[in-house]
Structure formats: C-alpha cells, structure tokens
Amino acid sequence: TTTEVVMENVTAFWEEGFGELFEKAKQNNNNRKTSNGDDSLFFSNFSLLGTPVLKDINFKIERGQLLAVAGSTGAGKTSLLMMIMGELEPSEGKIKHSGRISFCPQFSWIMPGTIKENIIFGVSYDEYRYRSVIKACQLEEDISKFPEKDNTVLGEGGITLSGGQRARISLARAVYKDADLYLLDSPFGYLDVLTEKEIFESCVCKLMANKTRILVTSKMEHLKKADKILILHEGSSYFYGTFSELQNLQPDFSSKLMG
C-alpha cells in the first residue's frame, strides 16, 4: 500500500531535551497518530510547548504524491519530518498516516561494512530492486572503479568515501527499503548541481514515482516538479499549494526558500 499524509493545525515546541521528547512521543502516541482507514497522512493544527518550532501547520498529500518542503535555516523543516516519524510530539493538532516510513537524513552516515551492506542491511535482497536503486542514485560508476565492486569495505581499514558518495549511499539505503512514505531531508548534500538534477529526476521522480514522498529542498526545479509545496518560515506555513499558485503570488518569496 502507498500512503497519504495529512497534518491538521499542528503546533509543536522544543521545551525539553530531544531524548525526553522522543520517549514521551513513544509513550504518548495516542495524541500523535490517529487510525486512518484510507491510508493517509495528514497534519492538522500542529504545535509544541514553550516557543513553538511549528505553528498551525496544515497539509495533505495524496498517495503517490511529492510534497516539497522549503524554508530558510531554522524554519522547522526537519522538525516537521521528526513529527511524522514520531520523534517530536505535537502539543495540539493531528497527524495522520499509516504504513512504513523510510527516512534519508540530512547528514549521511556510513556503517562499517561493504557498500552493499550499507544499502541493503536488514532488508531482504532483491537483485532487480538493488540494481535499479544503484543506477538511480548514480552509484554504478563509483562501484565499478573499486576492485571489489560493491563488496568493497567502507569504514575502518576500508575505503574512505567523499561527501557526495556518502550522500548517494545514504539515499540509496533509504530508497531501497520498501516503505509507504519516504522522508528525504535535503538528501543531495555535497552533490554538484548536475548530479543533483540527474538523481532528482532518475530517483525521486522516476524510480519513486508511485511512492508518497516528502522532500526537504530549496531548489526551484524541485518545487516545479512537486505536486504540492509547503514553505515554512519561522515555524509557520508561509505558503501551501501548487507551483502555479506560488507563481501567482506577488511578493518575492526567494528569501523564505534559501537558508
């Protein structure tokens, strides 16, 4: 099944340490998640206690859609994803979604092990899926250059990767996992403009075309391709709608996008 995501009037605060919030969210998740028969994820009037990191956020994504989330540094983009994952709990509002989530963090990481292990560890191996992901994340050429190919060991005593290679492996790990909802938090770090454009097309737009995706991005090209756009500014929803609706806005919104 694919998923739909809804957030209604969601507000959230960073009042306590992250760990305490994480524990609270797990124990108290009746506030966070409501059963949703039609497999949807939605945010409704979502906020937290103290100074809100998110205030009155609303959006809805249909199954298979791409939501682009933009905003300057500190606007609340990562916090939004954390709420969907249950690592941050709303003080008010509703988030609805169901199914499995796969998350690609902003800062990519590599586990000690082979390239292949880094992508498929803990997930059943499917040759066709694996090859498709490797190709879409532009890892084929990198892998072909290593004598041991994808059995090349990374980490201690192994190969040291560039930031761009790390980012692509991290994305491949998230995409290879079969999930209903993919949360991609600025996944193209360290990539040059051309590579980013190609991977966005081949991976996010084509390979994942039927999946529900939330992409944190500041790139205009990504916004154009998204089904819906949410621009956050200081924790609030500055804009929510389609790209054509965004174009009709008179004020200059670029300062809200770039961080």
Epitope: M85, S102, F103, P105, W109, E156
Partner: nanobody, 117 residues
Framework: QVQLQESGGGLVQPGGSLRLSCAAS????????MGWYRQAPGKQREPVAI???????RYAEPVKGRFTISRDNAQNKVYLQMNSLKPEDTAVYYC???????????WGQGTQVTVSS
C-alpha cells in the same frame, strides 16, 4: 570524542536470554546511528542490529525475530535483547555509534557472549 561502555555479556545456555547495554558519553549531540556488531572467533566483525535516525531498526538475517535493539535517547544508551540464543551466537559483541556530519565511527571495547551447555 565519544566513549562507549558495554555491559551484560556472559555465559548462557542455548535457548537462554541476555540483555546487552551500551552507554555513550562525550560528544553525543549529533548521533546518526547506534548499533551492535559481533565478531566470532576466526571471523570478521559483522553487523547484528542497527538503529538510526527516524526510528529505523534493521537486523542481520540470522538474528531476526530473536534479537531486539532499543534506544534510550535521553540517556544515550542502546540495548540489545537477545532471546533464544544459539551456540552460533557466541562472539564478542561490540557497541557501535556513528556521529557527526562527517560520519565518524566509535566503538566500545566489546563484551563476550558465550552460548554453551
């Protein structure tokens, strides 16, 4: 720098259970992932279970359904509950943590787990 301290290893009979604990101290504000690796005599160190940001937990095939990884983020601890232990689970178990923007790995000293009757 990050320091890791494991505990909970020991000798257990086949079918028995153990719970390993690992406490992280130091620069633990930017943890990307935590987990457990093991190294059996004469073999390479291999991943057993990993918990990363977003609550993603993954397990090696031989331990699925028997081992459970959990985290206490407030105290920077990671646990490995090992049930239905088999002789082939005998190994030194290492706590592993990946942190920082440049993906730095830190390891514990290891704790011995022996499954034998």
């Amino acid at each position: 720098q990050v320091q890791l301290q494991e505990s909970g290893g020991g000798l257990v009979q086949p079918g028995g259970s153990l719970r390993l604990s690992c406490a992280a101290s130091g620069s633990t504000s930017s943890i990307n992932a935590m987990g457990w690796y093991r190294q059996a005599p004469g073999k390479q160190r291999e991943p057993v279970a990993i918990s990363s940001s977003g609550g993603d937990t993954r397990y090696a095939e031989p331990v699925k359904g028997r081992f459970t990884i959990s985290r206490d983020n407030a105290q920077n601890k990671v646990y490995l509950q090992m049930n239905s232990l088999k002789p082939e689970d005998t190994a030194v178990y290492y706590c592993w943590l990946n942190w920082g923007r440049t993906s730095v790995n830190s390891w514990g000293q290891g704790t011995q787990v022996t499954v034998s009757s």
